[in-house]
């Protein structure tokens, strides 16, 4: 039932953050005009991955792309691959923990590929939400040192762009979003790796025990029970003696509510 | 169409008040910036201000801070500068204009001018 | 405070003429960003309030004549009118609208003889 739980919101946190970190991947608001005081000029900049824009004060908003690759500062390029690498991470691991879910029943899948799986994708979500947050980081470093030396533009040079303006750049929302999602897929990953250990079956082998009842014998060949996955094409073991101790029917085949997230 | 259409002529005394109105039609009074120009006789042009009447925001020159406030009224869709401590150096016309959109932050539009005469 | 400086202070053209006004600003009025000039141009003719010409220092305003053209960036720009109407008698001002507080040059009457 924990389990259950810890995988459950796992997954739900990784998702929320993958849905962050694409968020924040698409924003153009990774810097921004900085307004301390008084705003000094009547636009207002601001910058993307992707594209700056200007924002007039009627509300007017023009924005243009960053249409040349090369001329590019290699660190921009840089924070759009870590970026893009943990989108695709987290896509990839959503997609798997998706499948690896204790409450999703796929054909006859062991509850031992079910565990690998929710590691797997455990595993994919720390390292999604660590290129986001590395990506993040490296932006605002590039933010803050050139805040600093109070470089007119972050991409001086760039696209045949002129110096002209000193115009100081601090950071957008974008970054924070980017921050506060790649910290939830980390999270959500370290739980999805928590769910996991629960996951694992435990190879617990039952020494042979034999009950007589009435004149007859029968007996439970051991090897004893793994962890069912409640579906597939598994031989009914059926009550013969009560002692307490249930069917695989009654134990797994119907879900309980608290096995839902 | 666009248009705004300011208050008639002050004369007023020394050290006194005044309010000049520019009621506005023909677009969503809400949406665009309201600027006031200043222009003492045979002289050229000297912005005092802007105001956003959807917001309420307002930005002046230094030279005119505390000079002038600037307001308006939406029900009405009016502006309203009002001058303070007059001295013979606030005569002059001043003009409300409204900022257009998608203009690089030019005036689009021009109320008449409103003349005021500080004189005792 | 931005300072516009325009030139001449007035010039007397007869009809039909090229004329050229020019303004100066004392910071660029380049945005880097778009990579538009945030200058505009006024016209005023006599016992009227200005009315708008030019923006984004080339940018014509709707209804405004193909005579007129404005250029330059940074800080350097001109205004020039390709045939010179009768209808052009006016002062024609340049506007910084680009840094607080915006501000205006000081004018260019144009004459006409």
């Known amino acids: 039932m924990a389990v259950t739980a810890c995988q459950g919101l796992g997954f739900v946190v990784s998702l929320i953050g993958i849905a962050g970190i694409i968020a924040a991947t698409c924003m153009d608001q990774w810097s921004t005009q900085d307004l301390y005081n008084n705003p000094v000029t009547a636009v207002f900049n601001y910058q993307g991955l992707w594209r700056s824009c200007v924002r007039e004060s009627s509300g007017f908003t023009e924005c243009r792309g960053y249409f040349t690759l090369l001329g590019l500062p290699a660190m921009l390029q840089a924070v759009r691959a870590l970026m893009i690498v943990g989108i695709v991470l987290g896509a990839i691991g959503l997609l798997v923990s998706i499948f690896a879910l204790k409450c999703i029943r796929i054909g006859s899948m062991e509850d031992s590929a079910k565990a690998n799986m929710t590691l797997t994708s455990g595993i994919m979500f720390i390292v999604s939400g660590l290129c986001a947050i590395a990506g993040v980081s490296v932006f605002a470093n590039m933010l803050v040192t050139n805040f600093w030396m109070s470089t007119a533009n972050m991409y001086t040079g760039m696209g045949g762009m002129v110096q002209t303006v000193q115009t100081r750049y601090t950071f957008g929302a974008a970054l924070f979003v980017g921050w506060v999602a790649g910290g939830l897929t980390l999270i959500g990953g370290v739980m999805m790796c928590i769910a996991c250990r629960g996951l694992a079956p435990e190879e617990t082998n039952y020494k042979a025990v034999s009950y007589h009842a009435s004149g007859h014998s029968v007996a439970y060949k051991p090897g004893g029970f793994k962890a069912s996955t409640g579906f597939g094409s598994n031989t009914k073991n059926k009550k013969i003696y009560d002692g307490g101790a249930r069917t695989e029917d009654e134990v797994q085949s119907y879900p309980s509510k608290h096995d839902y997230v | 169409q666009v248009q705004l259409k300011q208050s008639g002529a002050e004369l007023v005394r020394p050290g006194a008040s005044v309010s000049l109105s520019c009621k506005t039609s023909?677009?969503?009074?809400?949406?665009?910036?309201i600027h006031w120009v200043k222009q003492r006789s045979g002289q050229g042009l000297e912005w005092i201000g802007r105001?956003?009447?959807?917001?309420?925001?307002?930005y002046y020159n230094e030279n005119f801070e505390g000079k002038a406030t600037l307001t308006a009224d939406r029900s009405s869709s009016t502006a309203y500068m009002q001058l303070s401590s007059l001295k013979s150096d606030d005569s002059a016309v001043y003009f409300c204009?409204?900022?257009?959109?998608?203009?690089?932050?030019?005036?689009?539009?021009w109320g008449q001018g409103t003349s005021v005469t500080v004189s005792s | 405070d931005i300072v516009m400086t325009q030139s001449p202070s007035s010039l007397t053209v007869t009809t039909g003429e090229k004329v050229t006004l020019s303004c100066k600003s004392s910071?660029?009025?380049?945005?880097?960003?778009?990579?538009?000039?945030?200058l505009t141009w006024y016209q005023q003719k006599s016992g009227q309030p200005p009315e708008l010409l030019i923006y984004?220092?080339?940018t014509r305003e709707s209804g405004v004549p193909d005579r007129f053209t404005g250029s330059g960036s940074g800080t350097d720009f001109t205004l020039t009118v390709s045939s010179v109407q009768a209808e052009d008698l006016a002062v024609y001002y340049c506007?910084?609208?680009?840094?607080?507080?915006?501000?205006f040059g000081g004018g260019t009457k144009l004459e006409i003889k």
């Open positions: 984004w220092a080339s």
């Open positions: 023909g677009y969503i009074f809400t949406s665009y910036w």
């Open positions: 204009t409204r900022e257009g959109y998608g203009k690089g932050n030019a005036m689009d539009y």
């Open positions: 910071q660029s009025l380049l945005n880097s960003g778009n990579q538009k000039n945030y």
């Open positions: 506007q910084n609208d680009y840094y607080f507080p915006f501000t």
């Open positions: 105001f956003y009447p959807g917001t309420g925001t307002a």
